[in-house]
């Protein structure tokens, strides 16, 4: 009865190791990449250009909307907005398609884009997007939901200054006017790969599978002085800012046109310089947190000097600190992981080693003939399973 | 203070192209979306298109695609619309209006240029 | 497309007068709505926008109403100022639409 028992259980242990192996194996595959503890309120369907449905590990089923930037928000499928901002996109793609556009609808479940770069996120928001390319950077911006258009500063500098009817600057927070609050994951670079999407809007050609809806027309002639850029009617694309008040609020991040130095920008853009060493294949595993929001700062006009980075940069965040506090973890890459495996693997070995030599020494206990210890083969060691037994288990030597 | 100037009114013939002008100040021309809007004589408002400046993204209102070009100046902080192929419909007032990037909030537009009239006929 | 549907196309009152404009959405554009107030020969103003958020500036006389689909702008006590043309405009999807236009005039 024992002994077999402690086959059973020596099956068991492979077994469990197996599958743990297995499924580290598979990890970056099922498990759930984008954590949304918090839903978005509603964004209009003419900002978004995809939608992706997060993973069935995730437990809570969310919508991932990819707006017009890059940026993505968590919303509830439930809402009848959401509803119908998929139904609109679903139709938007249907018609591409249609007309020789060459989107992809992607079915299955999200695996976020390879290389999530620059953007905004916001509270309860976890995000572990699997790098395995360019070097990943996020980007935090505000979520000063309706901080007034502001000239460009940055929205985590309390310059107290308020603004005249002219200038841009905060009105409410947007929580108070139902914008979406606390929900904005992290920017997507323009360019990227392997992303799987549940469905979404057009998808423009390109070298990505994501729609980055870039104009695909020759540009038209123009004078010199416009060539810096040429966008022409031929190629349409979801991409608009709002009115009223200069106001940037939840995912966006403006670029200041003061000439401010880096050390005045308070706290927040410490966060991201670990980004800026990442190599390929680093992931990064975002926790926001929600901090304080009670007020968002008021920002004047300030002439030149362009001191933020453009979204291809992904560097420095551009944040509330009142309403965020941002944890941001680098970890271990491809690498690290294999390591990991191996170390398994070898603890795999050592603990089959141990069960076999405990095995050996019950049976030679039971007073198992010594010459019935079994045969070498490769390494690993035919053990009787009992004395008077003729089937028999292996274990390493 | 936020402020769209737009060129002078012009006057062209059917099957021209005319271009007109928005030069932006008093905000970061790269942040914000120009929006162009068409106001015929007499008639209501009509979007023409959207476009960030520095981003090749644009998008347009169909009726208006394949004539409509827009452009951006940014070392002068200027944002062009081209319109081709003018017809006598095309007279009316063109507006270049602007909001705010935020990704949530949509495009209702805050600052608006003064306009300017294109009268085309033969 | 969305249409959007304005009435009454023109209206007369009164100074001190309250005045209700309505704007109907062909589908739904889930409060994303703006109102703007146009004078003869100047471009449109904002006025309220997203869940009746007053842009600022704007008195307080005006407020905005409404859901799904249809919605409505009110000013509670009509100032000389306020005779105008004002327009409602979803952006909810592209292409972003206006209303027809309320002429509103002294009666």
């Known amino acids: 009865m024992a002994p077999i028992s402690l086959s059973w259980l020596l099956r068991l242990a492979t077994f469990c190791h197996l599958t743990v192996l297995l499924a580290g194996q598979h990890h970056g595959v099922t498990k759930c990449n984008i954590t949304c503890s918090k839903m978005t309120s509603k964004i209009p369907v003419a900002l978004l250009i995809h939608y992706q449905q997060n993973q069935a590990s995730c437990g809570k089923r969310a919508i991932i909307l990819e707006t017009r930037q890059h940026r993505l928000f968590c919303a509830d499928p439930k809402e009848q907005w959401v509803k119908d901002a998929m139904q609109h996109l679903d139709r938007q793609a249907a018609a591409l398609t249609r007309n020789g556009g060459t989107f992809e609808k992607q079915i299955g479940e999200v695996k976020p884009r390879t290389t999530p770069a620059a953007g905004g996120m916001d509270e309860s928001v976890v995000l572990e997007p699997e790098a395995t390319g360019e070097s990943s950077s996020l980007e935090p911006t505000p979520s000063s939901q309706e901080a007034q258009r502001a000239l460009g500063t940055s929205p985590e500098l309390p310059t107290g200054v308020t603004g005249s009817s002219g200038t841009r600057l905060p009105p409410t927070p947007k929580a108070q006017d139902g914008g979406p609050v606390g929900t904005e994951l992290f920017r997507v670079p323009p360019v990227s790969t392997a992303a799987t999407w549940q469905s979404s809007a057009p998808h423009q050609p390109g070298p990505s599978l994501w729609a980055e809806a870039k104009t695909s027309e020759a540009p038209s002639t123009q004078d010199p002085s416009t060539q810096a850029s040429t966008a022409s009617s031929p190629a349409p694309e979801e991409n608009a800012p709002s009115e009223g008040q200069r106001v940037w609020g939840q995912g966006q991040s403006p670029r200041p046109e003061n000439s401010l130095e880096r050390e005045e920008m308070g706290p927040v853009p410490a966060h991201t310089d670990a980004f800026q060493d990442w190599g390929p294949g680093s992931m990064a595993h975002v926790s926001v947190v929600p901090v304080s929001s009670e007020g968002t700062p008021s920002r004047e006009p300030v002439a030149s000097g362009s001191w933020t980075p453009k979204a291809e940069e992904p560097i420095h965040a551009t944040m509330d600190p009142q309403r965020l506090g941002v944890l941001i973890t680098p970890v271990p890459d491809a690498q690290a992981a294999t390591r990991r495996q191996a170390v398994g693997l070898l603890a795999f070995l050592g603990l089959l080693f141990c069960l076999g030599v405990a095995m050996f020494t019950y049976q030679s206990l039971q007073g198992c003939p010594r010459k019935m210890a079994g045969e070498m083969a490769e390494g690993l060691r035919y053990i009787p399973r009992s004395c008077g037994s003729n089937s028999y288990v292996l274990v390493p030597v | 203070e936020v402020q769209l100037v737009q060129s002078g009114a012009e006057v062209k013939k059917p099957g021209a192209t005319v271009k007109i002008s928005c030069k932006a100040s008093?905000?970061?021309?790269?942040?914000?979306?120009i929006h162009w809007v068409q106001q015929a004589p007499g008639k209501g408002l009509e979007w023409m298109g959207w476009?960030?400046?520095?981003?090749?993204?644009?998008k347009f209102n169909e009726r208006f695609k394949g004539r409509v070009t827009i452009t951006a100046d940014k070392s002068t902080n200027t944002a062009y619309m081209e319109l081709s192929s003018l017809r006598s419909e095309d007279t009316a007032v063109y507006y270049c209006a602007t909001s705010p990037t935020d990704e949530t909030q949509g495009d209702y537009f805050d600052y608006w240029g003064q306009g300017t009239t294109l009268t085309v006929s033969s | 497309d969305i249409q959007m549907t304005q009435s009454p196309s023109s209206l007369s009152a009164s100074v001190g007068d309250r005045v209700t404009i309505t704007c109907r959405a062909s589908?739904?554009?889930?409060?994303?709505l703006a109102w703007y107030q146009q004078k003869p020969g100047k471009a449109p103003k904002l006025l309220l926008y997203?869940?009746?958020t007053l842009s600022g500036g704007v008195p307080s006389r005006f407020s905005g109403s409404g859901s799904g689909t249809d919605y409505t702008l009110t000013i509670s006590s009509l100032q000389p100022e306020d005779f105008a043309t004002y327009y409602c405009q979803q952006f909810w999807s592209t292409p972003y639409t206006f209303g027809g236009g309320t002429k509103l005039e002294i009666k």
């Open positions: 476009y960030l400046p520095g981003d090749d993204s644009p």
């Open positions: 589908g739904r554009i889930h409060d994303f």
């Open positions: 997203t869940d009746n």
């Open positions: 008093g905000y970061t021309f790269t942040n914000y979306y």
